[in-house]
Amino acid sequence: EDWQCPRTPYAASRDFDVKYVVPSFSAGGLVQAMVTYEGDRNESAVFVAIRNRLHVLGPDLKSVQSLATGPAGDPGCQTCAACGPGPHGPPGDTDTKVLVLDPALPALVSCGSSLQGRCFLHDLEPQGTAVHLAAPACLFSAHHNRPDDCPDCVASPLGTRVTVVEQGQASYFYVASSLDAAVAASFSPRSVSIRRLKADASGFAPGFVALSVLPKHLVSYSIEYVHSFHTGAFVYFLTVQPASVTDDPSALHTRLARLSATEPELGDYRELVLDCRFAPKRRRRGAPEGGQPYPVLRVAHSAPVGAQLATELSIAEGQEVLFGVFVTGKDGGPGVGPNSVVCAFPIDLLDTLIDEGVERCCESPVHPGLRRGLDFFQSPSFCPNPPGLEALSPNTSCRHFPLLVSSSFSRVDLFNGLLGPVQVTALYVTRLDNVTVAHMGTMDGRILQVELVRSLNYLLYVSNFSLGDSGQPVQRDVSRLGDHLLFASGDQVFQVPIQGPGCRHFLTCGRCLRAWHFMGCGWCGNMCGQQKECPGSWQQDHCPPKLTEFHPHSGPLRGSTRLTLCGSNFYLHPSGLVPEGTHQVTVGQSPCRPLPKDSSKLRPVPRKDFVEEFECELEPLGTQAVGPTNVSLTVTNMPPGKHFRVDGTSVLRGFSFMEPVLIAVQPLFGPRAGGTCLTLEGQSLSVGTSRAVLVNGTECLLARVSEGQLLCATPPGATVASVPLSLQVGGAQVPGSWTFQYRED
């Protein structure tokens, strides 16, 4: 019989229900924005905005200061007071729409939904390792701002993204706001603008450059700005917007907008469609060929990548990559594939595709029919003409006007659909050693920390844990402070170590010591933990073998049994080859001689399942007693594996030595031609791994084996005669003298 060890699912080596408690802060209301500051002199802060209030926290998430930012018109509003005696506009709550650092000053800038979306500048005042906010400055000059031209109206109640860039001595605010007809009619915010902060902090310089959705499209064409960032010579905005100005406005797609970070102008504003797909390696029934599109970006983050992922993305280590979590539609509802997919866009490749698109628009010979695009911002035109014009005039350059690059940039899900039902709502990517880790928040309030690698058929988890008991979605914006990430969920801010919250979710020593080095996991007797959690026997260099099962569970007291042991940490080497003298198995008092691995039986084990097998030949000693006993595996002097060496003993109960007894055989005669069905009755006839009924030394083919009965078909006899009949179990004869009589056919 060829018994095989049952597979152990890989998931059995970890427990994602383990509770981790991470430092948190209760903000007293739904967190609307959050940003962190790390100064040159070890001072740091976390700024958390909720409706009508701004909290300043120390690096330990303890409250340092709190500022009333609304309601507008309320005498207690501390930011409103900075604008002098009012009224400044209609009264109402202040929802924070923008919270950014101006690193040049340094200062915090907050902009809310009230007071025409104006901003306030708060100089940072270090006090030891904490930071306080100076009295706010109102970034609004009444005499400069009119409803139709308002350089100081920054934030839209529908959402605004801001990236601050230093150019020379000036700070430029790259602003992108969602608009509709009502918002546009009220103090004219712009869709995309670049505004210079005035040196006296009295507001933003007039005459700023901007693009806005044209009035005729404002009702039907809505742009959501999902993320903005600055890297290299450019500022980028990521948008979700209708794929067409003229077609169904619910058919959305994702675009990357690129602006120069070195010149505060919008002539080189470029857009590129980003296409993310789930293309399963094995296509499921119902899934479209060529991959299922996931057109809607939910969250994004750009980061330099570690060596392994860099190689897989065909770039150099440390190069910047834009990561995006995409869903199938605004509701995020699934099609046939997973709820969320993650695509990676190397920035260098994005930039080249954009630059190439500009050349195609502007080079000669002209490519007929190539549109400049962005018809929601500007008059339609064909390349190389400027918007709204039939031809280039001699003193204008084709390159100095906004352009939608005609090609989209398509990528496939890095996780190959393995996020499954998880709805990702927050993303932050870090490089740890040469590993790239995605820290993801989910719709149900969990944090997933997963290595970003391409095309594996399983997820490499650093951790997967619940932030708290509320189960509220983790919010989109994530901030980093030192070696921690700050996630917001509901009214709470949580501080999560980038190395993971701990190691207790790894249940086996092998899984524990295979964890990434940066996690600092070690084995403490029977659990996985970080050194500070294990004052006793914490170590990172060896694991004992672990027996989980064996077969058979009984064997004959006389004769041999081929014993198969199942478990983990037997070998550490996929070949399962064992150096001489390293593995010692005893069953009761009796040794079990290791058997060489049968290479024909070696099966590739998928990484999602794991099991190791070890075979040995058990020959009981004469002193061995009948009855139950233990199986013990001791491994010593094994050469170390990649992560640890195997060393130690594992003991499992449940093996019994038995004495087979043969009580009756029938019939005792049969034809010489053979084929008589013999029934042998007794006790413990099925013990061990081998048995044979011999009729005159020739094997009687076994048809059925049970504890109390054997059935076999007799072999042909040489002559009519009475011949000896015997039963061997494990190669040893069962006591008793029996004969079988061959008769004429």
Epitope: A316, D348, D355, E359, E363, S455
Partner: antibody
Framework: EVQLLESGGGLVQPGGSLRLSCAAS????????MSWVRQAPGKGLEWVSS????????TYADSVKGRFTISRDNSKNTLYLQMNSLRAEDTATYYC????????WGQGTLVTVSS | QSVLTQTPSVSVAPGQTARITCEGN??????VHWYQQKPGQAPVVVVF???DRPSRIPERFSGSKSGNTATLTIIRVEAGDEADYYC???????????FGTGTTVTVL
């Protein structure tokens, strides 16, 4: 007028090396992805390698990965392909091509790998 | 790595229509480009981004795409159209450009 001119081909023994060059003119070289494509005698087109303008992203066909290296010098408007550990099956005409559309091609340079 | 399969050869009489197909499991999600290669010459792009045509290519050449099949159509075929034709896509799962197996068009 856009022109791409390959050079550097020739006869080389198995295990040997060659460096191909592609000189570009008539267009702004730096913004474009540039690629090498080869065609064995009597066979179809086979993409070999591509590189972006900064050189920060390079990709290779599995058949040449680890043996060939693509590079470019934007100041000289030139694309290169360093070919090491050449094999008989690398015998082909090697073309350089412009852009993600491969909208312009050179006339090709013949590489023969034979002992 | 993905494969683009083309019909090896198509024969067509002058003035008739030639249709060349290209099948592959990542055509639906990617732009398809078509190239013409005459004996002893370098390839020339005749259709790009599924349906667009460079200005120097006659209007007789057109491209279309349905599901996982792209088609290059040449109407009113002329003797000068006799050549090998290749489709090509970008395979985003491997970061490779992939050419089709090629179709030889013979004008009878």
């Amino acid at each position: 007028e856009v022109q791409l001119l390959e050079s550097g081909g020739g006869l080389v023994q198995p295990g040997g090396s060659l460096r191909l060059s592609c000189a570009a003119s008539g267009f702004t070289f730096s913004p474009y992805i540039m690629s090498w494509v080869r065609q064995a005698p009597g066979k179809g087109l086979e993409w070999v390698s591509s590189i972006v303008s900064s050189g920060g992203w390079t990709t290779y066909a599995d058949s040449v990965k680890g043996r060939f290296t693509i590079s470019r010098d934007n100041s000289k408007n030139t694309l290169y392909l360093q070919m090491n550990s050449l094999r008989a099956e690398d015998t082909a005409t090697y073309y350089c091509a412009r852009g993600r559309l491969f909208d312009y091609w050179g006339q090709g340079t013949l590489v023969t790998v034979s002992s | 790595q993905s494969v683009l399969t083309q019909t090896p050869s198509v024969s067509v009489a002058p003035g008739q229509t030639a249709r060349i197909t290209c099948e592959g499991n990542n055509i639906r999600g990617q732009s398809v480009h078509w190239y013409q290669q005459k004996p002893g010459q370098a390839p020339v792009v005749v259709v790009f981004d599924d349906t667009d045509r460079p200005s120097r290519i006659p209007e007789r050449f057109s491209g279309s795409k349905s599901g996982n099949t792209a088609t290059l159509t040449i109407i009113r075929v002329e003797a000068g159209d006799e050549a090998d034709y290749y489709c090509q896509v970008w395979d985003s799962s491997s970061d490779h450009f992939v050419f089709g197996t090629g179709t030889t068009v013979t004008v009878l």
